[in-house]
Amino acid sequence: NFMYSKTVKRLSKLQEYQQYYPSLTCVMEGKDMEDWSCCPTPWTSFQSSCYFISTVMQSWTKSQNNCSVMGADLVVINTKEEQDFITQNLKINSAYFLGLSDPKGWRHWQWVDQTPYNKNVTFWHSGEPNSPDERCAIINFRSEEWGWNDVHCHVPQKSICKMKKIYI
């Protein structure tokens, strides 16, 4: 009876999410493998988040709006492990917008989700950021490693969206 009611609850939650995400990929997790954590298909998952790589070339603001429509934000990178996971799925000859910007050009960098910007957990390429006119951040492959660079926000780039996993 308990299992039945849990299944019914899950089905109604799935129906609720289906209007936003036609397909979800879920895995069982938790102590008793009773919780399901899901990401929209074909997003990838890492820890408690889902990631989507958009190959559409758009400005930073348009890229953020595009993520927002999908219930996400441009990616906020919190750890080296998270960055290493994300970069496994990136093309080395491309650049991708991050959810990091400095709209006034005052070198006051801010994450789109209001996560505090911690200078100690940043992965700028050597010599970056280097221009107050370049107010948006990308991740790209340079000098044999992935890192961040400041670029013009209006210049179209690919992008990475991130959202919290859906738990049902």
Epitope: S59, T61, K62, G105, D133, R135, C153, H154, V155, P156
Partner: antibody
Framework: EVQLVESGGGLVKPGGSLRLSCAAS????????MSWVRQAPGKGLEWVST????????YYPDSVKGRFTISRDNAKNSLYLQMNSLRAEDTAVYYC??????????????WGQGTTVTVSS | DIVMTQSPDSLAVSLGERATINCRAS??????????MHWYQQKPGQPPKLLIY???NLESGVPDRFSGSGSGTDFTLTISSLQAEDVAVYYC?????????FGGGTKVEIK
Amino acid sequence: EVQLVESGGGLVKPGGSLRLSCAASGFTFSSYGMSWVRQAPGKGLEWVSTISSGDSYTYYPDSVKGRFTISRDNAKNSLYLQMNSLRAEDTAVYYCARQIYYDYAYYFDFWGQGTTVTVSS
Amino acid sequence: DIVMTQSPDSLAVSLGERATINCRASESVSFRTSHLMHWYQQKPGQPPKLLIYGASNLESGVPDRFSGSGSGTDFTLTISSLQAEDVAVYYCQQSIEDPPTFGGGTKVEIK
């Protein structure tokens, strides 16, 4: 006082080439992105190309891509537009304009007086 | 590309009266509190001159009878009390993404 002075316009036959120049003074040229904007006779404004302050980024509309090349020489405080394979529809006054960044984008705060390009056989 | 549509094409207003010019973008040119729309004035035989940036910020040296407003896709330039020297063509321009695009212009004349 900020000054932008364009030169190099003239009459050219279809298929011909011209190189426009813009001499900048009164500001630190190397710190600013620059653009060319044109205006066909009796028509509105059409952006033609952009170059970033450090020369790392150039951008063109489809109408001129592959035919026009924007460049700059920061040591000479000069902006250039090399125009090849010119067509009748390229006939216009060409303005050079300075870009000022504002939040996520930019606007044009100073414009030169323009130089006239006429493409006709 | 973002298409900018200005209305009206031309406008005749009596001296001292209010002139209002509208500009509509084919998609939003705002992001949060940033409105990436700008206005220029072009008098006959002269280059364009910046009037308003960021939808509502008056450029230095521009008379305060000029004002701008709007967000998203709809923006307005207002001349509160038209003067003879305001006879010109006015253009809006978006810069939220490349390519930057201009409206077709609105010609303001004295009635």
